[in-house]
Amino acid sequence: QDPYVKEAENLKKYFNAGHSDVADNGTLFLGILKNWKEESDRKIMQSQIVSFYFKLFKNFKDDQSIQKSVETIKEDMNVKFFNSNKKKRDDFEKLTNYSVTDLNVQRKAIHELIQVMAELSPAAKTGKRKRSQMLFRG
Amino acid sequence: QDPYVKEAENLKKYFNAGHSDVADNGTLFLGILKNWKEESDRKIMQSQIVSFYFKLFKNFKDDQSIQKSVETIKEDMNVKFFNSNKKKRDDFEKLTNYSVTDLNVQRKAIHELIQVMAELSPAAKTGKRKRSQMLFRG
């Protein structure tokens, strides 16, 4: 059994999150993850989910009673999601820490926008996609 | 030329982001994107970048002078990053809108943690990885 399981059970007690009523009104993440089978689609969604958990854990960083559990889970997330690559994790953290209200950050983001957009689609590397592909489908 | 280019140039003027001094102290996004060639790694990073831009645009939603530019760029992001798939974009938006300080959201997130973790690594779908694969690499 992976180390995170025991520690996640510990967090469930702490957050009173073991009761069946917690599942009322649907899931946060599981339903969405079910929708996406493609690895690249899953990474788009999981990126947001992982950053949510990191933010949540940061909010409870001073609570000693769950420190060990939080650290173990974060470590296991590093292994599973970042494939144990510290550089990948560090780059991710940088992105999550940029402040959207910082004027210098805003200017930089807009300055880089055209190049960021040019790289967004996988097709960007293999030539330009036809405009006919560019409708919005549901 | 994609429609976003002209509109991004318009935003550069609005944000005074065209000057060379904006590039001082390194890039926000471009340097990080250079580090990752694998499509799934790129999606992890781009997911954070796109959510940053959406948040930034939301902060300026009442500014009429850049409304058209913002809308055009968002539309092009939908095409390029979400492959024009509205369901994908909607699921993404849901994830970015969850409040980390909402007690019900916290409980749900912890309730789902074990299952989310089990799905994090690509290998999760093809059987359990050997423990020897689970080291932390730099």
Partner: antibody
């Protein structure tokens, strides 16, 4: 100040065994992954083995897999390397090294290093 | 497994600048951190650069690290060479399959 002190090296015949120890002080030992790196006389550095802070995960270079065992005793702040079926090519100075940053299962860089202990495998 | 290839030796005069290269044979140099260690004769290695370009406290700013993705090469640059910089220098990175790789080492001679 972080200190790492290796011991247990010496002369051993091919096929023999040795157990190296590394006594650590000046940091929270259990929070850091630890490694053994060796250096044959006049040669470069070679990573040998690593272990997570808890001791739950261990990793080996192909050249020593099945012969060497890394372990740690966090209550004694000590790292070990049990070396069996020793060969002439295992002759080297063996360094113990701490991970450069905490909170990772294994090191991504090595800092600091101990002074090393010399293992000589010869008949 | 990839290899990290360094020049066997480099030499330069005091006060000058020297660059030691470390080329990754396969896989991208930018996708894992690169470290540099200095080893003086008879001593254990010490870190001079970690995480591509960061300097541990106590290491002078004459030492700098850089990465060039186009040549798949990491470089250690030492400016204002001093006699005490004479040593062996090793680059190190993760190999992508649970192993840590070292370059073969470069002997720096200060003339």
């Amino acid at each position: 100040e972080v200190q790492l002190l290796e011991s247990g090296g010496g002369l051993v015949q091919p096929g023999g065994s040795l157990r190296l120890s590394c006594a650590a002080s000046g940091f929270t030992f259990s929070s850091y992954a630890m490694s053994w790196v060796r250096q044959a006389p006049g040669k470069g550095l070679e990573w040998v083995s690593a272990i997570s802070g808890s001791g739950g995960s261990t990793y080996y270079a192909d050249s020593v897999k099945g012969r060497f065992t890394i372990s740690r005793d966090n209550s004694k702040n000590t790292l070990y390397l049990q070396m069996n079926s020793l060969r002439a090519e295992d002759t080297a100075v063996y360094y113990c090294a701490k991970d450069g940053s905490s909170g990772w299962y294994v090191p991504h860089w090595f800092d600091p290093w101990g002074r090393g202990t010399l293992v000589t495998v010869s008949s | 497994n990839f290899m990290l290839t360094q020049p066997h030796s480099v030499s330069e005069s005091p006060g000058k600048t020297v660059t030691i290269s470390c080329t990754r044979s396969s896989g991208s140099i930018v996708s894992n951190y690169v470290q540099w260690y200095q080893q003086r004769p008879g001593s254990a290695p010490t870190t001079v650069i970690y995480e591509d370009n960061r300097r541990p406290s106590g290491v002078p700013d004459r030492f700098s690290g850089s990465i060039d993705s186009s040549s798949n090469t990491a470089s250690l640059t030492i400016s204002g060479l001093e006699a005490e910089d004479e040593a062996d220098y090793y680059c190190q990175s993760y190999d992508g399959s649970n192993r840590w790789m070292f370059g073969g080492g470069t002997k720096l001679t200060v003339l």
